[in-house]
Amino acid sequence: TLNSVLNSNAIKNLPPPLGGAAGHPGSAVSAAPGILYPGGNKYQTIDNYQPYPCAEDEECGTDEYCASPTRGGDAGVQICLACRKRRKRCMRHAMCCPGNYCKNGICVSSDQNHFRGEIEETITESFGNDHSTLDGYSRRTTLSSKMYHTKGQEGSVCLRSSDCASGLCCARHFWSKICKPVLKEGQVCTKHRRKGSHGLEIFQRCYCGEGLSCRIQKDHHQASNSSRLHTCQRH
């Protein structure tokens, strides 16, 4: 039943059939076998790399972006490519690895509060207590199609991580996407293995912060595969 599957008190990595395999009578998720949710559908390992076709960056993993594999190649054929590290060339934020952004064609670290006062196309909705709008929550308004505003704060609805303030990423929460904190050292993280290995993530965690990677906690090496705890650890 849904209540056993979607109990929201913890982050869920649901196994098939909710990940999309056939035949579960209690499931009404419309999914194809092997698809991971919510859009990070290609967490390959190096030894099992398969190019994943995409139409936009959001269809790729947090360490990837969507582009044509060859410069000047067929624009209709795009795949998820590995993100660009600091000081590599870029054309947009999504090309740069987590913790970086694209500035003047180069991936640079985002730990300076570079987003303050930046002109943005998207209106970020605030979860503040200034109850001034029809729906009862505060909302920043705009004088024109572009506006100056601070990036989305924790809990703000977002479309992509570049909508969120420094130190936050855009991740799934229930059936929506909100800005959540990038994980700090010692915090539990989600290690995505290869494509098709996990199901519907109702509560997605952010990635580990700068200089950290998601690894099995040392004292959990002896635990069974399924119960291994991953935490953000120094490289």
């Epitope: 929201s8 982050i11 959001e58 729906d135 929506s176």
Partner: antibody, heavy 114, light 112 residues
Framework: QVQLVESGGGVVQPGRSLRLSCAAS????????MHWVRKAPGKGLEWVAV????????YYADSVKGRFTISRDNAKNTLYLQMNSLRAEDTAVYYC???????WGQGTLVTVSS | DIVMTQTPLSLSVTPGQPASISCKSG???????????LYWYLEKPGQPPQFLIY???NRFSRVPDRFSGSGSGTDFTLRISRVEAEDVGIYYC?????????FGQGTQVEIK
């Protein structure tokens, strides 16, 4: 202004189909999960279906599973509910609802009657 | 499904007097994000639900401050400090932490 406006309700015979629409405005529609909830005459509210922000994931109440289909068009800021094989017990006011920062529309009445 | 149980089912109140409605959930509505996904709303004939309180104790815009919510975990209360004639209707609690969203049976509030 921030609002949801449902349309498409009406009187329909049992076994027939109807498609409801919900037009969203004033907020980042494509970032929110959206739900349909209904209220039958003299009864309490009943949750019907949910669709994720990107349209990839959908869940339904057992009472409508296999008959109703929830969908969305983020380019048009619109949520849909395709209702097939309608029954008398589907008669209700149907509301679309935004999750997290809960917002409801004014509802549209569906009457299934021969 | 999470069962939401409201008491009392009806309440007759003198204008200016306080009123209190209880809602108990079959399991905790506290999420790991620290929020408790419990709402209160008012239903009047022919009108859509009018949401009063979100996340246990936060008032929606333009909701008079005579309405307040409290509680945690599985036990919640809606209080009206001084009932007014316009407050009549059916009050419901609702949880959205888990699918399907579920609702209390409703508490009919009327004026004496």
């Amino acid at each position: 202004q921030v609002q949801l406006v449902e349309s498409g309700g009406g009187v329909v015979q049992p076994g027939r189909s109807l498609r409801l629409s919900c037009a969203a405005s004033g907020f980042t529609f494509s970032g929110y999960g959206m739900h349909w909830v209904r209220k039958a005459p003299g009864k309490g509210l009943e949750w019907v279906a949910v669709i994720s922000y990107d349209g990839n994931d959908k869940y339904y109440a057992d009472s409508v599973k296999g008959r109703f289909t929830i969908s969305r068009d983020n380019a048009k800021n619109t949520l849909y509910l395709q209702m097939n094989s309608l029954r008398a017990e589907d008669t209700a006011v149907y509301y679309c609802a935004r999750e997290l920062r809960v917002l409801w529309g004014q509802g549209t009445l569906v009457t299934v009657s021969s | 499904d999470i069962v939401m149980t409201q008491t009392p089912l009806s309440l007759s109140v003198t204008p200016g007097q306080p009123a209190s409605i209880s809602c108990k959930s079959g399991q905790s509505l506290l999420h790991s994000d620290g929020k408790t996904y419990l709402y209160w709303y008012l239903e009047k004939p022919g009108q859509p639900p009018q949401f009063l309180i979100y996340e246990v104790s936060n008032r929606f815009s333009r909701v008079p401050d005579r309405f307040s919510g409290s509680g945690s975990g599985t036990d919640f209360t809606l209080r009206i400090s001084r009932v007014e004639a316009e407050d009549v209707g059916i009050y419901y609690c609702m949880q959205s932490i888990q699918l399907p969203w579920t609702f209390g049976q409703g508490t009919q509030v009327e004026i004496k």
